[in-house]
Interface confidence: medium
């Protein structure tokens, strides 16, 4: 058993049929010694008396809010949550496996630049009685500070007959140098509590590996005289690290016909313009990637040929 | 500055071309190592990230873009220890920091070159003959060092009398390649920045 926060405790249980469970001793936080009784949740049934209460925790029915009273007055509370371990593996019932970039990916994180700011998100089908708490650090043995905001519901969507909820959080490394060479990864830890079930999820990464620039901005076409060619120009996204001559991007320019089956023409360039042939009803799209470290491409920015 | 030059003028700044070749060569070598040594811990998640140049050179600090010198977090360990002139600077006015930056890059390359050559000698003794260092990568390191043209005493190749542990050598190769790739990215950024300045 360990303390998650004040008056909230997590009991770690091996979860299998007829498991013996864990013996837990609760102590009433009071100077009083006599006349103390214990109840669980909303029930008025007295579970025991005395300053301490010993219970065998085996299942969710044994978890909940234990309260000690004296003469009708509440003295203190202890909330017990369960953390299940099945076949030596901690349960992951609360969050959905996103399966990207690999199986057992529950948390996904991205950064728009090298400023030390990043966003993580996760999915669940649970809509109520759900809380999340996020902590992060650079390294684990001698951790350096990363500050995370509160996790908030950022989207809900329908998937077949089910609803899916997306939560996200923004974090910022306390003292980040954009030019630094990372040798210790960022660790992100999410505590998830659904009713009386506790689970924790972790992700470990280098900012350089989760970089995904915003799409190029101000995408414009300039027809070239007496030619089917156009000059496409764009700019670095505002959110990208500066100076751009140090944090350089490379770009992919794509000409796509209106039908998905039509052949795509692609050009790669380090410049912020390119000359392409604009076909009728086609559209031109441009995306960006760090020029020197191949992390993710940005989403496409598009403009119609017409 | 917002319009990076796609094909640098080699006369103007020859090191940019060499640094791009270096990054390509080390990335290819790392990919080859990850594929060949698939049953060894060789991915970024599996290895310990060590920097053999730590406390010996100060490339990131010395080569910091002017715009980032206002960032407190980037100024933890600005060291100013050596100053020399390199031929990459062509006929430009050479600032103290730029010379320090390029000589720091040169020292990095020299250290990695020694480590890689020593390691290659061990790998050549491996009866499995599983992996060797790409000669192209070693040549590219050499070319960039020559372009930087710093005078420095030659470091002898480390020799070891004990029987090499090939498993450990291959794991060390992965660690070195990962670290060298990260340094090669920094070197490329620096050369691109200097070329645009």
């Amino acid at each position: 058993i360990w303390e998650l926060k004040k008056d909230v405790y997590v009991v770690e249980l091996d979860w299998y049929p007829d498991a013996p469970g864990e013996m837990v001793v609760l102590t009433c936080d009071t100077p009083e010694e006599d006349g103390i009784t214990w109840t669980l949740d909303q029930s008025s049934e007295v579970l025991g008396s005395g300053k301490t209460l010993t219970i065998q925790v085996k299942e969710f029915g044994d978890a909940g809010q234990y309260t000690c009273h004296k003469g009708g007055e509440v003295l203190s509370h202890s909330l017990l949550l369960l953390h299940k371990k099945e076949d030596g593996i901690w349960s992951t019932d609360i969050l959905k496996d996103q399966k990207e970039p690999k199986n057992k990916t529950f948390l996904r994180c991205e950064a728009k630049n090298y400023s030390g700011r990043f966003t993580c998100w996760w999915l669940t089908t649970i809509s109520t009685d759900l809380t999340f708490s996020v902590k992060s650090s650079r390294g684990s043995s001698d951790p350096q500070g990363v500050t995370c905001g509160a996790a908030t519901l950022s989207a809900e969507r329908v998937r077949g007959d089910n609803k899916e909820y997306e939560y996200s959080v923004e974090c910022q490394e306390d003292s980040a140098c954009p030019a630094a060479e990372e040798s210790l990864p960022i660790e992100v830890m999410v505590d998830a509590v659904h009713k009386l079930k506790y689970e924790n999820y972790t992700s470990s990464f280098f900012i350089r590996d989760i970089i995904k620039p915003d799409p190029p901005k101000n995408l414009q076409l300039k027809p070239l005289k007496n030619s089917r060619q156009v000059e496409v120009s764009w700019e670095y996204p505002d959110t990208w690290s500066t100076p751009h001559s140090y944090f350089s991007l490379t770009f992919c320019v794509q000409v796509q016909g209106k039908s998905k089956r039509e052949k795509k023409d692609r050009v790669f360039t380090d410049k912020t313009s390119a000359t392409v042939i604009c076909r009728k009803n086609a559209s031109i799209s441009v995306r960006a990637q760090d020029r020197y470290y191949s992390s993710s491409w940005s989403e496409w920015a598009s403009v119609p040929c017409s | 500055r917002n319009l990076p030059v796609a094909t640098p003028d080699p006369g103007m700044f020859p090191c940019l071309h060499h640094s791009q070749n270096l990054l390509r060569a080390v990335s290819n070598m790392l990919q080859k190592a990850r594929q060949t040594l698939e049953f060894y811990p060789c991915t970024s998640e599996e290895i310990d990230h060590e920097d053999i140049t730590k406390d010996k050179t100060s490339t990131v600090e010395a080569c910091l873009p002017l715009e980032l010198t206002k960032n407190e977090s980037c100024l933890n360990s600005r060291e100013t220890s050596f100053i020399t002139n390199g031929s990459c600077l062509a006929s430009r006015k050479t600032s103290f920091m730029m010379a320090l930056c390029l000589s720091s890059i040169y020292e990095d390359l020299k250290m990695y070159q020694v480590e890689f050559k020593t390691m290659n000698a061990k790998l050549l003794m491996d009866p499995k003959r599983q992996i060797f260092l790409d000669q192209n990568m070693l040549a590219v390191i050499d070319e960039l060092m020559q372009a930087l043209n710093f005078n420095s005493e030659t470091v002898p190749q480390k020799s070891s009398l004990e029987e090499p542990d090939f498993y450990k050598t291959k794991i060390k190769l992965c660690i070195l390649l990962h670290a060298f790739r990260i340094r090669a990215v920094t070197i490329d950024r620096v050369m691109s920045y200097l070329n645009a300045s």
């Epitope: 998100w121 950022s154 989207a155 809900e156 969507r157 997306e166 923004e170 | -």
Partner: nanobody, 125 residues
């Protein structure tokens, strides 16, 4: 109060493209969910696409998947959301509305307190 101003609508031939944009002003925020809805002649207003706050995850109605793309530009603490519409069909004709919320992005209209005036899109030969 957030002001949303849509632009980019117009008359286009079937198979053609349009890009709608919606600029949010009146308050400095970037952590905002943005969505496009449309109202076709004689029909109820319906969800088209959204871009979630913080994560910027996108979602599309089945009838526009693969043809429409939503993205945003969070420049200078102001938000502009775009809807790139390719391979337009006559049934895409209608008034397109931009909506914003500091809450989560959903496909439900009643979760968006702020709405633009709408921009007319007509697809006809």
């Amino acid at each position: 109060q957030v002001q949303l101003v849509e632009s980019g609508g117009g008359l286009v031939q079937p198979g053609g493209s349009l890009r709608l944009s919606c600029a949010a002003s009146g308050r400095e925020f970037t952590s905002v969910s943005m969505a496009w809805f449309r109202q076709r002649p004689g029909k109820e207003r319906e969800f088209v696409a959204f871009s979630a706050r913080i994560s910027e995850t996108t979602e599309y109605a089945d009838f526009v998947k693969g043809r429409f793309t939503i993205w945003r530009d969070n420049a200078n603490a102001k938000v502009t959301v775009y809807l790139q519409m390719n391979n337009l069909k006559p049934e895409d004709t209608g008034v397109y509305y931009c909506a914003a919320s500091e809450g989560p992005a959903t496909i439900r209209q009643n979760t968006y307190p702020d709405w633009g005036q709408g921009t007319q899109v007509t697809v006809s030969s």
